[in-house]
């Protein structure tokens, strides 16, 4: 495949991540998302900050954003449920649940991802997969096809160093290394998958990408299990 990137990653194998969603605003990719139930996509709350006047939809079963693919389908959003404690000026509680207008048609290219319910930190050094259609270089180029990268989990103490995120990483957040390989603009809301299980959601703060002293920040889904269950119920 071409050397496309999240940042420092590569093009994903087509349809190998059937849980992957593109949250779209007025027909254009805005954020990543992850199918967690037949009718629900989990993303980041900040993604909808600028969407007040626009039409929000969810694309499932896609590899290319522009090319026709048999598995691709665009769903309208029946209900958008941001976490009640999410706020524009913080990265905390940056979660959003989108209820699709109907249950997704499941198949090899569209399938929910199991998410972590046990509220325990992922071991530092664990390699986790992050995927998205976010920018792929420091010029800001956006890819047409899904990209992914494997990133090692970084311990919270290191991530909270003054030189890094200076205490901002609560127990409800986790970090992954960001030395050249990283998630970036447009990847927000997408999944951080460790051992085939959804562990984190890319936060949508305006962080510098690809700088090892500014690790990627991900919302730990296990910490929000009660809220997710209450919305999906």
């Amino acid at each position: 495949p071409p050397r496309g990137r999240i940042l420092g990653g590569r093009e994903a194998e087509a349809h190998a991540r059937p849980y992957m969603a593109s949250v779209q605003l007025n027909g254009a990719h805005l954020c990543g998302g992850v199918l967690v139930a037949e009718q629900w996509v989990l993303s980041a709350a900040h993604c909808l900050e600028d969407a007040a006047d626009g039409k929000v939809q969810v694309l499932l079963g896609a590899h290319s954003l522009s090319q026709p693919e048999p598995s691709k389908r665009l769903y309208d959003v029946l209900r958008a449920v941001p976490h009640p404690d999410s706020q524009p000026d913080t990265i905390d509680h940056d979660l959003l649940l989108l209820q699709l207008s109907e249950k997704a048609t499941l198949g090899p290219a569209v399938r929910p991802l199991p998410w972590q319910r046990v509220d325990r930190d992922v071991a530092p050094g664990t390699l986790c997969d992050v995927a998205g259609w976010g920018i792929v270089n420091h010029a800001g180029r956006r890819p047409d096809s899904l990209q992914h990268v494997l990133l090692p989990v970084l311990d919270r103490a290191t991530c909270n160093r003054r030189t890094h995120h200076d205490g901002a990483i609560t127990e409800r957040l986790m970090c992954a290394e960001s030395n050249r390989r990283d998630s970036c603009k447009g990847d927000s809301g997408g999944p951080l998958v460790c051992g085939g299980v959804l562990e984190g959601v890319v936060t949508s703060g305006s962080r510098v990408c690809g700088n090892r002293k500014k690790p990627g920040i991900y919302t730990r889904v296990a910490s929000y299990a009660a809220w997710i269950d209450s919305v999906l119920a």
Epitope: P2, R3, I135, N137, H138, A139, G140, R141, K185, R207
Partner: antibody, heavy 113, light 106 residues
Framework: EVQLQQSGAELVKPGASVRLSCTAS????????IHWVSQRPEQGLEWIGK????????KYDPKFQGKATITADTSSNTAYLQLSSLTSEDTAVYYC??????WGQGTSVTVSS | QSVLTQSPAIMSASPGEKVTMTCSAN?????MYWFQQRPGSSPRLLIY???NLASGVPVRFSGSGSGTSYSLTISRMEAEDAATYYC?????????FGGGTKLEIK
Amino acid sequence: EVQLQQSGAELVKPGASVRLSCTASGFNIKHTYIHWVSQRPEQGLEWIGKIDPANGNTKYDPKFQGKATITADTSSNTAYLQLSSLTSEDTAVYYCVNAMEYWGQGTSVTVSS
Amino acid sequence: QSVLTQSPAIMSASPGEKVTMTCSANSSVSDMYWFQQRPGSSPRLLIYDTSNLASGVPVRFSGSGSGTSYSLTISRMEAEDAATYYCQQWSTYPWTFGGGTKLEIK
């Protein structure tokens, strides 16, 4: 459709400053990087710098540090290039560029007394 | 900083002819962009990440290379390809352009 509309040509006196604007349509500048590139008459292209409009972070070619200041206003979806202490050497066409992929039409700046 | 040298500075080709121009860096770079600028127009992205064709660019254009040596090839010259071509590197700050290759039609 992605478009970048730049402000009109400028004729300015040596020592003065000028601010050029670049208004985007078809996309939100917060979701990308905006670059500025200069081109002197009959010369090649020079990268001046870029801004991440989401947080205001900028990066410059050291050659333009102190000469150029890049800012952005996300509420109007507009990026700006301010050029200070102008000399005849700053006479050029200045382009704003989204992700080095979509280019504005350019703004001609002429420095002359 | 990375200095990019394009050669030749000026060249001409007949319609249908194959055209190759090069971009040499004084130190290794990981990827190259190529732009086309027709007289009186803004530059246009042709090639990104060394070899990938930008949207809407005819397939007669191709890019290749690695390390310090990169090239842009037009498989069959057409009249509308008469323009100046610039390479640009994204590996190290400051990001730099080559001086350009002016391609004329015979």
